[in-house]
Amino acid sequence: EKSDLRTVAPASSLNVRFDSRTMNLSWDCQENTTFSKCFLTDKKNRVVEPRLSNNECSCTFREICLHEGVTFEVHVNTSQRGFQQKLLYPNSGREGTAAQNFSCFIYNADLMNCTWARGPTAPRDVQYFLYIRNSKRRREIRCPYYIQDSGTHVGCHLDNLSGLTSRNYFLVNGTSREIGIQFFDSLLDTKKIERFNPPSNVTVRCNTTHCLVRWKQPRTYQKLSYLDFQYQLDVHRKNTQPGTENLLINVSGDLENRYNFPSSEPRAKHSVKIRAADVRILNWSSWSEAIEFGSDDG
């Protein structure tokens, strides 16, 4: 890691150290410890206090971003005395050199693109590298395919998402021969960054009085079940005047996705298309291909 760690400690130090790869803060165990706690304070003065590990000489921070700089603190009491130690974790390097405008999206159920822009004060020879760790911290994924702009990595394409979990930690490090480059990190939920494909297998069957639309839920990266989906149907009469309102119908996901609506013969030519979203986020997919039914002389 490029960041330097500075310790602020009294004479008898706890030797506090932080491993950013595992997000583990550890210190030298003291004999006859009666109390210990660890926490961090960020630049906005928010405090995060994780549970202590079983050995009580370390703690692991789960959901934290470090790029704005944080201060770790450890308090230990023994039967003889008390210890306190701070550990500054700054984002060293020149201000404004870190990757910016970072975003990722999952598409086609098993592909992901992340993009970023070079920092405004980054030198010409800057190079960025993306690392992803899942919430269980069991695996680090290095970007397999970089997207480049004039030789600088400004994005990443992943075609194997098996190492991801529902929440993941993204780290963009930078290197340069000229100056130190700051890092950027972010926590992203897969459910918030997935763009669904439209529903598949859309069919329309009509009898003399009704038409029944059926469809299949889209394949997604997240393991979603039928109640997690919301659908919108656009039933559209062909050859209507411009500006005529389309009929948008909201349908909740079900085991058998269907929508039955009255439409008596002879029926004019209509088209129907469907889109899907996560019921909690309503991030709509693109529309499915329009399916036509009815006749021109209806």
């Epitope: 979990t165 979603l224 079940s225 997690d228 058998e256």
Partner: antibody, heavy 120, light 111 residues
């Protein structure tokens, strides 16, 4: 219409095992996730386990670990629950259900239940 | 002893509004994990009424609504009807137990 048809009531002796089946009709089991829940008058509903997408495998409730096995035969759209080393407090109605949403999980629909009585 | 706490019974006259509370802790409802609600008519299997804290599956009347705040959730039934007489259960996920947990159930009586 999707239905879950469960096997009939069972009477077992303490220490024995019981295997409850749950046949899915109207849908392919391979596209569904099944969870099992039991209900007793004293303890109410107890979730026993089912498919967990985060782990990508069947997970079991801690209190049944080592005694319960959940299996599936997708060729006949049937899920099975086996509970071993039965005790009298395992007397309950055992339900299979389909996961409507993994968040919770929300279960819909449920089978009609299988009464298992453990008595010497 | 159920992990989620519900009142054992509530009652109301036809047409009235009744609410059922469900109190959990920081490892389940307050974590925050989603809450589901089920209705169980006598001698039948449970039926899902609410999922994702406040969403109704198709076929569930809009007389049933739910909300969640902090470590507790509640189910409201408006325009109470005789066939609402049943047991109602809340459910959530509990991270300390690594599994789904239920409330002890609330019997709704229509007077």
């Amino acid at each position: 219409q999707v239905q879950l048809v469960q096997s009939g009531a069972e009477v077992k002796k303490p220490g024995a095992s019981v295997k409850v089946s749950c046949k899915i009709s109207g849908h392919s089991l391979s596209e569904l996730s099944i969870h099992w829940v039991r209900q007793t008058p004293t303890k109410g509903f107890e979730w026993m386990g089912g498919f967990d997408p985060e782990e990508n495998e069947i997970v079991y409730a801690q209190r049944f670990q080592g005694r319960v096995t959940m299996t599936e035969d997708t060729s006949i759209d049937t899920a099975y629950l086996t509970l071993s080393s039965l005790r009298s407090d395992d007397t309950a109605v055992y339900y299979c259900s389909i996961v409507g949403s993994f968040s919770g999980p929300a279960l819909r629909p449920w089978g009609k239940g299988t009464m298992v009585t453990v008595s010497s | 002893q159920a992990v989620l706490t519900q009142p054992s019974s509530v009652s109301g006259a036809p047409g009235q509004r009744v609410t059922i509370s469900c109190t959990g802790s920081g490892s389940n409802i307050g974590a925050p994990y989603d809450v589901s609600w089920y209705q169980q008519l006598p001698g039948t299997a449970p039926k899902l009424l609410i999922y994702h804290n406040n969403k109704r599956p198709s076929g569930v009347p809009d007389r049933f609504s739910a909300s969640k705040s902090g470590t507790s959730a509640s189910l409201a039934i408006t325009g109470l009807q005789a066939d609402d007489e049943a047991d109602y259960y809340c459910q959530s996920y509990d991270s300390s137990l690594s599994g789904s947990v239920f409330g002890g159930g609330t019997k709704v009586t229509v007077l």
